[in-house]
Interface confidence: low
């Protein structure tokens, strides 16, 4: 299709070489009130959607993204050619930074409902460059923690080296939705709740004598609790004896709950005690079976191909540990009568 009629937006992504930060492009199809590009029914004031990006289409996932090769080749479908770029509804997620992401990205509705819609598209010219400004070497992180129940703030990384007084007007989005009341380079949170977690985008406009462009940064905000003061507890096995059938296979599961730790380094392992000897058993990898803000439940199984008489004399011990301390639970096998 002819992209010469697309509205154009210029964006700058200045990435920190220090972090695996992400980036997003919204399909900012022009609002019908403001542009001749998209032919749509007018919205009454009450109907203005909270999604500023992509005002045009009723179905937010109904968008096609392309990249325009710099050599003039035909447009390429993003989904086929770029595994590190993921389309989620009307948003394009860049999973890894790098100057190779620079280029022109075009979005348009998949379904064209009238002849006027042919020109309903947006061309985004994205410039990507590493952060070189030494004076802002220690800008805000692209991953920020907020402690639940406390006050906190979310800083726009590209503006965190400027004072509030110098800062330009900032447009903030959370999970793609416009936060219309936020205009400064920092969002102040009076009390942190778990719903404050999410992907925040901050935009501001920069210009020179020739043109203007949008500077964008993406911040992953994680709400956390304080580090646990407790050692992990074993939820299973509860009993210290287990009835088994000789000659049959057996799986014993060890499930343990670990409280939140900023640096999470859980240990869960099985070892066997036989009279004076004890040794660690090679067992399948541990797996997380439930994860919440406050804790994580991890499971690790010991598998016996067949229970032998010798196993009845042994103790099977599950050992779990975090930075606070360790807990053990032993199981003695008993033949079913």
């Amino acid at each position: 299709f002819n992209i010469s009629g697309c509205s154009t937006k210029k964006l700058l992504w200045t990435y920190s070489t220090r972090s695996e930060e992400e980036f997003v492009l919204f399909c900012d199809l022009p609002e019908p009130q403001k542009s001749h590009f998209c032919h749509r029914n007018r919205l009454s004031p009450k109907q203005v959607p909270e999604h500023l990006p992509f005002m045009g289409s009723n179905d937010l996932s109904d968008v096609q993204w392309y990249q325009q090769p710099s050599n003039g080749d035909p447009l390429e479908d993003i989904r086929k050619s770029y595994p590190h770029i993921i389309q989620d509804k009307c948003t394009l997620h860049f999973l890894t930074p790098g100057v190779n992401n620079s280029g022109s990205y075009i979005c348009r509705p998949k379904m064209i409902k009238s002849p006027y819609d042919v020109a309903c598209c947006v061309k985004m010219i994205l410039e990507v460059k590493p952060q070189t400004n030494a004076s802002c070497e220690y800008s805000a992180s692209h991953k920020q923690d907020l402690l639940l129940g406390s006050t906190g703030s979310i800083s726009c990384p590209s503006l965190s080296c400027q004072s509030d007084a110098q800062s330009p007007a900032v447009t903030w989005y959370k999970n793609g939705k416009l936060l219309s009341v936020e205009r400064s380079n920092r969002i102040v949170v009076d009390e942190v709740y778990d719903y404050h977690q999410g992907t925040y985008v901050c935009d501001y406009t920069q210009s020179d004598t020739v043109s203007s462009w949008t500077v964008r940064a993406v911040v992953q905000v994680r709400t956390i609790v304080g580090d646990t003061k407790l050692k992990p507890d074993i939820l299973d096995p509860v009993e210290d004896t287990l009835e088994v059938e000789l000659g049959k296979p057996l799986t014993i599961s060890c499930k343990a709950r670990f409280g939140f730790e900023r640096v999470f380094n859980p240990v869960i392992k099985w070892y066997i005690k036989d009279s004076d000897l004890e040794w660690e058993v090679s067992v399948p990898e541990a797996k997380s079976i439930k994860s919440t803000l406050k804790d994580e439940i991890i499971e690790r199984n010991i598998i016996l191909e067949k229970v032998t008489q010798r196993d009845l004399r042994r103790k099977f011990v599950c050992f779990v540990q975090n930075s606070i301390g360790n807990t053990t639970q032993s199981v003695q096998l008993k033949e079913k009568r």
Epitope: R18, Y138, S141, C161, R186, Q220, G226, V263, N265, S323
Partner: antibody
Framework: QVQLQQSGPGLVKPSETLSLTCTVS????????WSWIRQPPGKGLEWIGY???????NYNPSLKSRVTISVDTSKNQFSLKLSSVTAADTAVYYC??????????????????WGQGTTVTVSS | AIQLTQSPSSLSASVGDRVTITCRAS??????LAWYQQKPGKAPKFLIY???SLESGVPSRFSGSGSGTDFTLTISSLQPEDFATYYC?????????FGQGTRLEIK
Amino acid sequence: QVQLQQSGPGLVKPSETLSLTCTVSGGSINNYYWSWIRQPPGKGLEWIGYIFYSGTTNYNPSLKSRVTISVDTSKNQFSLKLSSVTAADTAVYYCARDVGIAARNSYYYVMDVWGQGTTVTVSS
Amino acid sequence: AIQLTQSPSSLSASVGDRVTITCRASQGISSALAWYQQKPGKAPKFLIYDASSLESGVPSRFSGSGSGTDFTLTISSLQPEDFATYYCQQFNSYPITFGQGTRLEIK
């Protein structure tokens, strides 16, 4: 640019409490973890503990019974108190910012901004 | 606590030399290791994180490698400003610990 300015006495008497303050300028204390580290004369570095802007702390077990780290977000500063000092606590004390470097599924922390260091001598 | 042992404790080298410093952890720490440079009377400066990722602005002659328990810091061609003490640091579990340091001096 974030800078850390340390203040506090350079001489402390045995059995007294060592008190140091670190003031953060050029950026907010919010959303970061802040550490204290010390270095005895001619020796290596020893981590004392950290504080999150909200007040959550974690201390080195070897010093835990004597250490208190506190934060004052309104003044953009955090402080170290070490009680019952002896000559073995003579060292250069540093404050530092712990920054979370983002790997996709985890955080990797390093101390990327340091204070200038304060030489504290414990002597009567 | 996880112990980090650096070797050698000190070494002499000339400008242009290739130098390798090793750091061994008392237990596996994945790649949660950083390297710092400290000059006399100054605070440490952070060079490498995640065992091998170079901090922005650090010259490319510095490189790190390793995983688990054995790690190395290599300076491919020593420059006059590289003579300093180097420390490794683990952030895999608390308490955070540092190696005892390796002093690099001019031959």
